[in-house]
Amino acid sequence: FKVATPYSLYVCPEGQNVTLTCRLLGPVDKGHDVTFYKTWYRSSRGEVQTCSERRPIRNLTFQDLHLHHGGHQAANTSHDLAQRHGLESASDHHGNFSITMRNLTLLDSGLYCCLVVEIRHHHSEHRVHGAMELQVQTGKDAPSNCVVYPSSSQDSENITAA
């Protein structure tokens, strides 16, 4: 399987909400011995590999924001902790998974990574991630609503398997 990032750049005004999205592509095994662990974190553009660094999103670590379930099942993060920080991660039946950030501030600007790990009995993990940039703007140059920029075809599928 692969992870696609439909948009590589989100430009939003301060105070707005944004939903960053990744999509799981390709054959997804729905067997009883397969679990998908999905999460989000902030990162930096490493010299060797993007998304190697894992930094918290609004003080919540990737462990706090994870979802885990079998196949293309729907799931949401535990509400209290995430929602207190204006965050919610969710996953639907079609392989889409997202993080919603409410009331954006300039401090939210940066690189965001989604991670999917396939866990199956007696197999090494299969890891894939996607990366996208969030720019929060203020002042007269800021858009009135979030503007999203589609990924180029080669960027939209970011495959890192182990």
Partner: antibody
Framework: QVQLQQSGAELMKPGASVKISCKAT????????IEWVKQRPGHGLEWIGE????????NFNEKFKGKATFTADTSSNTAYLQLSSLTSDDSAVYYC???????????WGAGTTVTVSS | DIVMTQSHKFMSTSVGDRVSITCKAS??????VAWYQQKPGQSPKLLIY???YRYTGVPDRFTGSGSGTDFTFTISSVQAEDLTVYYC?????????FGGGTKLEIK
């Protein structure tokens, strides 16, 4: 605060079995691997294997197949390592560690010393 | 299995010195390498992940670098409490494997 609390030291006879526990607190137990690592006196770290409590998925170091058995009880947030047919080679400190999927061994238990002696 | 080799079992250093420990993987592990510190009678402690990133709360005198097969762990100014054992580990593919360890000793 994430913690792994391991059971106390064990003195065992050759041929016996021992079961070590690792109780997890401060995180969602079902969503991270529990790793088991062996360290003999004066030696390095040797990975035994892992269990993912949420699904029961297991991975082993081939060397420990038939020697080690992993179980996890999600109702008590406790993982177990059972070692069978003990010999002096099994005398070691056994550590449990947490590993979130796609990540490293970020939190370790204090270790359980197993001594096999007749 | 991927073999992680720490060529020096022991290294001599002095307080205030800069010291580097090397680790070589038997095949390409990209940047999927961690470094752990283990003090006598204690469990290992994660210091560096993904080859070059400090784990939460780790002092900035500890740094890591490398990719592919060659990795280096550096302490910029050794403190007395740093004189202990360090292990590298790959998490590129299971079975997860550790280096044999390098013990930092006083000169």
């Amino acid at each position: 605060q994430v913690q792994l609390q391991q059971s106390g030291a064990e003195l065992m006879k050759p041929g016996a079995s021992v079961k070590i526990s690792c109780k997890a607190t401060g995180y969602t137990f079902s969503s991270s691997w529990i790793e088991w690592v062996k360290q003999r006196p004066g030696h390095g770290l040797e990975w035994i294997g892992e269990i993912f409590p949420g699904s029961g998925s297991l991975n082993f170091n081939e060397k420990f197949k038939g020697k080690a058995t992993f179980t996890a009880d999600t109702s008590s947030n406790t993982a177990y390592l059972q070692l069978s047919s003990l010999t002096s080679d099994d005398s070691a400190v056994y550590y449990c560690a947490r590993r979130p999927p796609g990540w490293f061994f970020d939190v370790w238990g204090a270790g359980t010393t197993v001594t096999v002696s007749s | 299995d991927i073999v992680m080799t720490q060529s020096h079992k022991f290294m001599s250093t002095s307080v205030g010195d800069r010291v580097s420990i090397t680790c070589k993987a038997s095949q390409d592990v990209t940047t999927d390498v961690a470094w752990y510190q283990q003090k006598p009678g204690q469990s290992p402690k994660l210091l560096i992940y993904s080859a070059s990133y400090r784990y939460t709360g780790v002092p900035d005198r500890f740094t890591g670098s490398g990719s592919g097969t060659d990795f280096t762990f550096t302490i910029s100014s050794v403190q007395a409490e740093d004189l202990t054992v360090y292990y590298c580990q790959q998490h590129y593919s299971s079975p997860w494997t550790f280096g044999g360890g390098t013990k930092l000793e006083i000169k």
